[in-house]
Amino acid sequence: AWELTILHTNDVHSRLEQTSEDSSKCVNASRCMGGVARLFTKVQQIRRAEPNVLLLDAGDQYQGTIWFTVYKGAEVAHFMNALRYDAMALGNHEFDNGVEGLIEPLLKEAKFPILSANIKAKGPLASQISGLYLPYKVLPVGDEVVGIVGYTSKETPFLSNPGTNLVFEDEITALQPEVDKLKTLNVNKIIALGHSGFEMDKLIAQKVRGVDVVVGGHSNTFLYTGNPPSKEVPAGKYPFIVTSDDGRKVPVVQAYAFGKYLGYLKIEFDERGNVISSHGNPILLNSSIPEDPSIKADINKWRIKLDNYST
């Protein structure tokens, strides 16, 4: 058996700094939560303790605070690179500043793959955006490989500003051939990472043959097994288990929003890539977890321009 730890975030919405418990501006620092400096501490702690770890983001890093207003996505690329994310799926809000506002600050600057299988570029944009985002990526993890396929809400044209040269296809229709392609490449451990909401996440788990795990976003869904550690009320257990049409038990996860929690899912695979077991819970990033001093110093450096902006 081979064990994989999936760390995941979604719908962070520009919460680079720590926030209050309700994800608004941090007032009493001793009671604040989240933020990339605290996230980094926890991620590094887990990376040090466990051998096979992936850090994934399921979209909507863009939009939500003055950080995005001022930096327009450059802050997302910089700090996600600093935390060494392994992959990200495109969310609807990544298109809020148009396709150019996605390409220049994020797609060209991210060191990690940015994914969506159901967004197809056409016309003059096709060559401009080619290779900047991908339908899937095969990631080496230790001596194994894991396939990550991305997806994005097909409602994005009504929710954001992707323009007329991007077509948002049905998620399940677009995902199946990409998963099939991964199977032909002998990739037998496949994660669907995307931003279409919990209902679609469950449908993908049910309908897309070959998907082993679904890591979602968009609906800000909080899942938890046991007594929840803060104010969020769980919509179900973590992971939420869906029985696929071909009889497999597929774990589906999401980690609320605003960087308040870090999703933590441990998956055990057999030698054929079947999920043997899955367990975990979102980790509340409260003040018991110190902010990493190096990332915090970087945040403070970037913060200067925001202070100038607000005055």
Partner: antibody
Framework: QVQLVESGGGVVQPGRSLRLSCAAS????????MHWVRQAPGKGLEWVAV????????YYPDSVKGRFTISRDNSKNTLYLQMNSLRAEDTAVYYC??????????????WGQGTMVTVSS | DIQMTQSPSSLSASVGDRVTITCRAS??????LAWYQQKPEKAPKSLIY???SLQSGVPSRFSGSGSGTDFTLTISSLQPEDFATYYC?????????FGGGTKVEIK
């Protein structure tokens, strides 16, 4: 067990070329970034080159850029370093080292035993 | 390029001593720092990665700490087999760079 074995070192005249090889075993070679690190006699360690796990990207320090080329053959589990326009200051023990499984810079967890390159007329 | 400065360049110590080696980066490197041990005529050996994580099989008397620009390697109780040269290395960004080394000799 996990092992890296370098070969191809020797004595070469300034301006000439040499190709080093590193045979890997005991791990999934195609999953790891691979590096060359050198050590001049009586000196410290100097990083020379990296090639990412899939061969998509290569990085070099200014001291060897344009003269050295790193490559890999994943089907043969072998790493190479092609060294052209060699200079006296390239004289060193050259180590092959294993990096990480991503596109981010990494440390080296496994090292070969090294192969000596002497550039002298 | 990020410069790595190690101190001291050499030190003399006795078996059982607590030994501390420092490494300073010319700019912040978060926790992307590794430590290596090298004995004469041998290849380097990985001791610590991510500033404080012990490589598998390395004795627990070795420990690392630090973040940002200042880092420390500590040997809590020096053993005869620990007499060697120690190097730090940053892997925050390319080009990867090493410290100049610290030679730990028998007093």
């Amino acid at each position: 067990q996990v092992q890296l074995v370098e070969s191809g070192g020797g004595v070469v005249q300034p301006g000439r070329s040499l190709r080093l090889s590193c045979a890997a075993s005991g791990f999934t070679f195609s999953n790891y970034g691979m590096h060359w690190v050198r050590q001049a006699p009586g000196k410290g360690l100097e990083w020379v080159a990296v090639i990412l796990y899939d061969g998509s990207n290569k990085y070099y320090p200014d001291s060897v850029k344009g003269r050295f080329t790193i490559s890999r053959d994943n089907s043969k589990n072998t790493l190479y370093l092609q060294m052209n326009s060699l200079r006296a200051e390239d004289t060193a023990v050259y180590y092959c080292a294993r990096g990480g499984s991503s596109w981010y810079p990494d440390s080296f967890d496994i090292w070969g035993q090294g192969t000596m390159v002497t550039v002298s007329s | 390029d990020i410069q790595m400065t190690q101190s001291p360049s050499s030190l003399s110590a006795s078996v059982g001593d607590r030994v501390t080696i420092t490494c300073r980066a010319s700019q912040g490197i978060s926790s992307w720092l590794a430590w290596y041990q090298q004995k004469p005529e041998k290849a380097p050996k990985s001791l610590i990665y991510a500033a404080s994580s012990l490589q598998s099989g390395v004795p627990s008397r070795f420990s690392g700490s630090g973040s940002g620009t200042d880092f420390t390697l500590t040997i809590s109780s020096l053993q005869p087999e620990d007499f060697a040269t120690y190097y730090c290395q940053q892997y925050n960004s390319y080009p990867l760079t090493f410290g100049g080394g610290t030679k730990v000799e028998i007093k």
